[in-house]
């Protein structure tokens, strides 16, 4: 079948999800495409525990996550509700800053060097993290 019961080679398993950490940089949209090409998505952070796990693996490097407001409100790429969900913005962020001189504001979220989040220009070539969930079918205990 098409069930994914274990993580692919070079992916890291954690709490029934698989994570892949890039070592090169891409614009947010290209990173998003490369995650989707793997039947995955840019990482969606749903808890402090997941935040610490990702932060441990990426180190103090700007890294894209699956959160953006390119169409207005902030949205997670997998549909997780932003308003009620986990957040870890830096103080006074997001600020949709226009002063960078690159045109437009800042519509894509990334982990900063201390792990907290910032919004930035989506074209910046940052590293990225892909996430895919192990299939729910494989998480259920066997029927007795």
């Amino acid at each position: 079948g098409s069930e994914r019961t274990c993580c692919p080679v070079n992916w890291v398993e954690h709490e029934r999800s698989c994570y892949w950490f890039s070592r090169s940089g891409k614009a947010w949209a290209d990173a998003d495409n490369y995650c989707r090409l793997e039947d995955a998505h840019l990482v969606v952070v749903t808890s402090w525990e997941e935040q610490k796990f990702v932060q441990h693996h990426i180190g103090p490097v700007n890294t894209w996550m699956g959160l953006h407001d390119q169409n207005g409100p902030w949205k997670w790429v997998d549909g997780t509700d932003y308003e009620t969900g986990f957040k870890n913005w830096r103080p006074e962020q997001p600020d949709d800053w226009y002063g960078h001189g690159l045109g437009g504001g800042e519509d894509c979220a990334h982990f900063t060097d201390d792990g907290r989040w910032n919004d930035d220009v989506c074209q910046r070539p940052y590293r990225w993290v892909c996430e895919t969930e192990l299939d729910k079918a494989s998480q259920e205990p066997p029927l007795l």
Epitope: S2, N10, S22, K26, Y34, R36, L37, E38, D39, C130
Partner: antibody, heavy 121, light 107 residues
Framework: EVQLLESGGGLVQPGGSLRLSCAAS????????MSWVRQAPGKGLEWVSA????????FYADSVKGRFTISRDNSKNTLYLQMNSLRAEDTAVFYC??????????????WGQGTLVTVSS | EIVMTQSPATLSVSPGERATLSCRAS??????LAWYQLKPGQAPRLLIY???ARATGIPARFSGSGSGTEFTLTISSLQSEDFAFYYC?????????FGGGTKVEIK
């Protein structure tokens, strides 16, 4: 040995439809993204479309978006390209290509020999 | 979209000589570049990926170099089977784009 065999090409009138198939063997088909790449007569290569290994995500060149649909049947180890509203400029040899499989890249380590699509009245 | 420009369009070389093919990107593609060989009626063949890594089974006479916007494919000593079309492809950015190709012909 990896093999990719395209079929389904032929002559079709402008506005018509055609479905290309690519039968794959020699590798775990569902583990690899696949693409269609074309070459118009006397022209260079043009990437047309890609699909993820399990088929959850698809990608298209602007020139075919809304007209072409890529799909796959992993139980049959087969890749498809449904082409609608065909135009004269779609005339080309269409190649099926296997992604190398390195995350964060997409280049093609195996290709088929191609199938010719001719759009003409 | 990143535009890939290959030069020359045609390269006339004698067997045993060196061939140097150029590929230029309209903006930086880092090292996200592949080279392919095409012969009429045959399946295209991957030669080089990541700008300089030789694909499995590719002879050592093929080498790739460059990064950013300027790339080179070198065939150190042309064999009869090397006369063909050569294309570069960038995968730094979507959509994926190819160069217009270089034809290597017998001088």
């Amino acid at each position: 040995e990896v093999q990719l065999l395209e079929s389904g090409g032929g002559l079709v009138q402008p506005g018509g439809s055609l479905r290309l198939s690519c039968a794959a063997s020699g590798f775990t088909f569902s583990s690899y993204a696949m693409s269609w790449v074309r070459q118009a007569p006397g022209k260079g290569l043009e990437w047309v479309s890609a699909i993820s290994g399990r088929g959850s995500s698809t990608f298209y060149a602007d020139s075919v978006k809304g007209r072409f649909t890529i799909s796959r049947d992993n139980s049959k180890n087969t890749l498809y390209l449904q082409m609608n509203s065909l135009r004269a400029e779609d005339t080309a040899v269409f190649y099926c290509a296997k992604d190398h499989g390195i995350v964060g890249t997409i280049y093609f380590d195996y290709w088929g020999q191609g199938t010719l699509v001719t759009v003409s009245s | 979209e990143i535009v890939m420009t290959q030069s020359p369009a045609t390269l006339s070389v004698s067997p045993g000589e060196r061939a140097t093919l150029s590929c230029r990107a309209s903006q930086s593609v880092s090292s996200d570049l592949a080279w392919y060989q095409l012969k009429p009626g045959q399946a295209p063949r991957l030669l080089i990926y990541d700008a300089s890594a030789r694909a499995t089974g590719i002879p050592a006479r093929f080498s790739g170099s460059g990064s950013g916007t300027e790339f080179t494919l070198t065939i150190s000593s042309l064999q009869s089977e090397d006369f063909a079309f050569y294309y570069c492809q960038q995968y730094y950015n979507w959509p994926l784009t190819f160069g217009g190709g270089t034809k290597v012909e017998i001088k």
